[in-house]
Structure formats: structure tokens, C-alpha cells
């Protein structure tokens, strides 16, 4: 058994472009202990969507269904999606350090955006 | 029905060892995120000691770090706490306890009692 | 490390009335809209018992009379209509990712 699971039900989302998305993410354990954040893209060039320790992220909502009880909801809202916003996101687990070391990834959700 | 047992408390002298165990049955041990808090009448309760669910990860306050090793055999559905260099402030009850999602302790043990005194 | 101040230490209440604990952390406690504030009974020669999770969160099993609520850095449990079998001492728990999680010094609820 998986010591960590970060689980992105939804492979992809579908949004008509003014709308808000939401983006689902839970986290098998609060242990490792360490931040997650959200992610557009893979590898070096992805871009940072929402961190809650640092940074300014005006569309970006955390929405976690704190009655959840065997595991830790981080989800996100993104609101007024524009089709800027098209592609995918990824919910990643980090363990606290200096720097924090990335853990693990959720399978991400491709975000497409129609038109109004 | 969630039981766990400690056991390894006693009388033991300043600057020596004991080694608690906690035998866990009626829930996926191997799933759950495990920990030692104690109590004494004076402080209160205090967090020792939490491992992750498969072993890889622990976490000790400053209080024990670098005396206290927390492991655990998942195959044995059994934890340990090894305590080495006791001191008197070490004297407490031991509970073990059990957490689903490694935020609140979900079920605790009846605890073991250890006493660090010459 | 998280400071956690519990009030009062102690509390006598009238059976069928409300009793209240509150809880306040030196710094907050929240993260991802989740507080990682939790609440435990504990009753004479027994382990602690979990009663709420995250806040606000009843516990499975544990009677609705039990309630929580608060965020950041202060709490409240709620115990309304106190019962006779509800003499116990009643601890806060923060398990923040701030390392070291920590307690509160406890209340001891009694009937008057």
C-alpha cells in the first residue's frame, strides 16, 4: 500500500469561459508533513496556480470539505475562466524543508474551456 | 473493534533505556498514521512521536529528539517507541494512538506507565 | 512552537445547562480552509477520546450535544445540555503543519 496517495478524481473538467472550475484534490495523510500546491503543466516550465504560503493568487480559492475524515481535501476554485486558463492542472504534495522536496503528483485534470 | 495495547512501561534509573510496544488489532494498521503522546499531572498531555503509515517518515519534538526512535512493523501490526538517556521529566503514561488522515488522534491505548528515577 | 491558552481550568455547571471551553493558539492554526484544531474527553483512569476534528467536526459515534466551532486561533467546545456522564476533563490538540503539535492544559468540567 501507497504510503502517500494524492488522488485528482476528475480527469478532466469542462467550463464555459466567465464561469468558476473547481479543481478536486484530497491527500491520503497530513504526514509527510509539508505544503501542497497546484500547478499548470509539468516539468520545469509549469507555472505556479495557487500556494498558500507565499504569493497573491486573486481567482484562486481553496474550497476543502473539512468534514471529510479519512483524508485531506485541497481543493482549489478558479473563477472567471478565460480560455487563457485551458490545460492541466496538478495537485502536488511537498515535504516541509529547506527547500521543501516534492513527494508526489495527482494524475492531474485537463481544464477546457468553452465559449460563452 | 479498535484496540491498542502498551505495553514495556517500568522503574527504570537516569540515563537508561526502555523500549514500549503497541500492539494494534481491529483496523488497517498498515493504513494509519501512528503515534506516542504522554501525560503527567504536571504538564499535561505532550506529543512524542509520530511515524507515517508505511515507516518513512518521523516527527519528535525537541524534548526527545535524538533520545527517542519511533519504528514500526506493519507485517506484526506493532509499534515501537525506543527511549534511550531517560531523564525524571520522562516519567509519564505512554498512550499510544492511532490517526486515519495524520490530524486528530482517532482511538488511544489505555497507556503504560514509565518511571525514570534512581 | 504553538502556544495553546485553554479557559477556564475548571467549570461547574448546572446539569441541562451549556458549558463552554474556548482554546486560543499563539499563532493560526489554519491551512487550506481546514482548522487543525481538535477536541478530546477524558475521564478518570482512561485515555483521552476523540470528540471533534478539524474545528467543528463531530467525532462518529459521539453524541450532537458535543459541538465546535472557531478558526484561526480561537476555538470553542460546546457541551449543551451538559449530562451527568459528561464530568470529565476536556483537552484542545493543534496539529498544524508547525511543528510540534501541542496541547491545551485541559479543563475539568463538574456538576454544580
Known amino acids: 500500500e501507497e504510503e502517500l496517495q494524492v488522488i485528482q478524481p476528475e480527469k478532466s473538467v469542462s467550463v464555459a469561459a466567465g464561469d468558476s472550475a473547481t479543481l478536486n484534490c484530497t491527500v491520503s495523510s497530513l504526514i509527510p508533513v509539508g505544503p501542497i500546491q497546484w500547478f499548470r503543466g509539468a516539468g520545469p516550465g509549469r507555472e505556479l496556480i495557487y500556494n498558500l504560503k507565499e504569493g497573491h493568487f486573486p481567482r484562486v480559492t481553496p474550497v476543502s470539505d473539512p468534514t471529510k475524515r479519512n483524508n485531506m481535501d485541497f481543493s482549489i476554485r478558479i473563477s472567471n475562466i478565460t480560455p487563457a486558463d485551458a490545460g492541466t492542472y496538478y495537485c502536488v504534495k511537498f515535504r516541509k524543508g529547506s527547500p521543501d522536496v516534492e513527494l508526489k503528483s495527482g494524475a492531474g485534470t485537463e481544464l477546457s474551456v468553452r465559449a460563452k | 473493534e479498535v484496540q491498542l495495547v502498551e505495553s514495556g512501561g517500568g522503574l527504570v534509573k537516569p540515563g537508561g533505556s526502555l523500549r514500549l510496544s503497541c500492539a494494534a488489532s481491529?483496523?488497517?494498521?498498515?493504513?494509519?498514521?501512528m503515534s506516542w503522546v504522554r501525560q503527567t499531572p504536571g504538564k499535561g498531555l505532550e506529543w512524542v512521536a509520530t511515524?507515517?503509515?508505511?515507516?518513512?517518515?518521523?516527527y519528535y519534538p525537541d524534548s526527545v529528539k535524538g533520545r527517542f526512535t519511533l519504528s514500526r512493523d506493519n507485517a506484526k501490526n506493532s509499534l515501537y517507541l525506543q527511549m534511550n538517556s531517560l531523564r525524571a521529566e520522562d516519567t509519564a503514561v505512554y498512550y499510544c494512538?492511532?490517526?486515519?488522515?495524520?490530524?486528530?488522534?482517532?482511538?488511544w491505548g489505555q497507556g503504560t506507565t514509565v518511571t525514570v528515577s534512581s | 512552537d504553538i502556544v495553546i491558552t485553554q479557559s477556564p481550568a475548571s467549570l461547574a455547571v448546572s446539569l441541562g445547562e451549556r458549558a463552554t471551553i474556548s482554546c486560543r493558539a499563539s499563532e493560526s492554526v489554519d491551512s487550506y480552509g481546514m482548522s487543525f484544531m481538535h477536541w478530546y474527553q477524558q475521564k478518570p483512569g482512561q485515555p483521552p477520546k476523540l470528540l471533534i476534528y478539524?474545528?467543528?467536526n463531530l467525532e462518529s459515534g459521539v453524541p450532537d450535544r458535543f459541538s465546535g466551532s472557531g478558526s484561526r486561533t480561537d476555538f470553542t467546545l460546546t457541551i449543551n445540555p451538559l449530562q451527568a456522564e459528561d464530568v470529565a476533563t476536556y483537552y484542545c490538540?493543534?496539529?498544524?503543519?508547525?511543528?510540534?503539535?501541542?496541547f491545551g492544559g485541559g479543563t475539568k468540567v463538574e456538576i454544580k
Open positions: 494512538a492511532s490517526s486515519v488522515d495524520g490530524s486528530a488522534f482517532d482511538y
Open positions: 490538540h493543534q496539529s498544524s503543519e508547525n511543528l510540534p503539535w501541542t
Open positions: 511515524i507515517s503509515s508505511g515507516g518513512t517518515y518521523t
Open positions: 481491529g483496523f488497517t494498521f498498515s493504513s494509519y498514521v
Open positions: 478539524r474545528a467543528s
